[in-house]
């Protein structure tokens, strides 16, 4: 999906008012310095591409993020504010449903959510120069 035509300000508002705290709660008990940010993004469409990938694509050691509350909210926000997103996701979500896993918080998942927090922070500050 090409995130270029999304309403970025509305997605930012959604993140600030309904998503950010759930990421913090997921990470509760973890030191903020525990994980290094290794995933970055250069602009808002790129950030959303990376956020979608980390949130919804199962990875080795972390197959369960898609059913977390922050993930459901992310999916809902993208469906509302990215034209055509919901249509492109129908096949993907049906495939994901077949491999739905029980929610398990692993260290790999914590690391992945830490990366997500960094991507969202970057998404919210698009005018900052890339480090």
């Amino acid at each position: 999906y090409d995130f270029t035509n999304c309403d970025f300000e509305k997605i930012k508002a959604a993140y600030l008012s309904t998503i950010s705290k759930d990421l913090i709660t997921y990470m509760s008990g973890t030191k903020s310095t525990e994980f290094n940010n290794t995933v970055s993004c250069s602009n808002r469409p790129h950030c959303l591409t990376e956020i979608q990938s980390l949130t919804f694509n199962p990875t080795a050691g972390c197959a369960s993020l898609a059913k977390e509350m922050f993930a459901m909210k992310t999916k809902a926000a993208l469906a509302i504010w990215c034209p055509g997103y919901s249509e492109t996701q129908i096949n993907a979500t049906q495939a994901m449903k077949k491999r739905r896993k029980r929610k398990v918080t692993t260290n790999k998942c914590l690391e992945q959510v830490s990366q997500l927090q960094g991507l969202w922070r970057r998404f919210n500050r698009p005018l900052l120069k890339q480090q």
Epitope: I19, M69, A76, I80, Y85
Partner: antibody, heavy 118, light 108 residues
Amino acid sequence: QVQLVESGGGLVQPGGSLRLSCAASGFTFSSYYMSWVRQAPGKGLEWVSNISYDSSDTYYADSVKGRFTISRDNSKNTLYLQMNSLRAEDTAVYYCARQQYFDHIDIWGQGTLVTVSS
Amino acid sequence: DIELTQPPSVSVAPGQTARISCGGDSLGGKYVYWYQQKPGQAPVLVIYGDSKRPSGIPERFSGSNSGNTATLTISGTQAEDEADYYCQSYDLGSLNLVFGGGTKLTVL
């Protein structure tokens, strides 16, 4: 303007079935999660069920699991609630509602009354 | 699912400040929403994301959430604010929405 209009309520005997419908207008129905919330006479609000924009995810309150089925037809901008094995305690006003960002409701219908009684 | 506890009733004189509490285990770690419902009408969202007001909701409505308690505050309460108020959050395990039992606000 954004509008949700419920229909299908009425009197039904215990053990019976009923199907509620909700016609949506004024917004892109196929982009939103949708919910049913009920309110027994003189009581508080109780969330019943919700469904994702593409019908891939459905969730139910424990009190209705296995008896109620939520569905939607995006081509008709309509939400449904199939209610089977109805009990007296299912008597309530049933509200169709639009879920914003999955975790809360920003638009409500006016509700339809379901009465389960012999 | 989590349980949200509200006082059944709160009374306030016109022009005074009304506070309605909503208690729940580690509630501060989740977002809380508040709805106003007048007799015979559907609920209306008055606070979202703990403390934000939807457009059209008067500035006298505000919200906060920390620890185990969320609070809806109505400053300079008016007669038209008399209604039932419901807090709502969600269960992080089941992903279900959860409502408090409701509080009847009476403006004396």
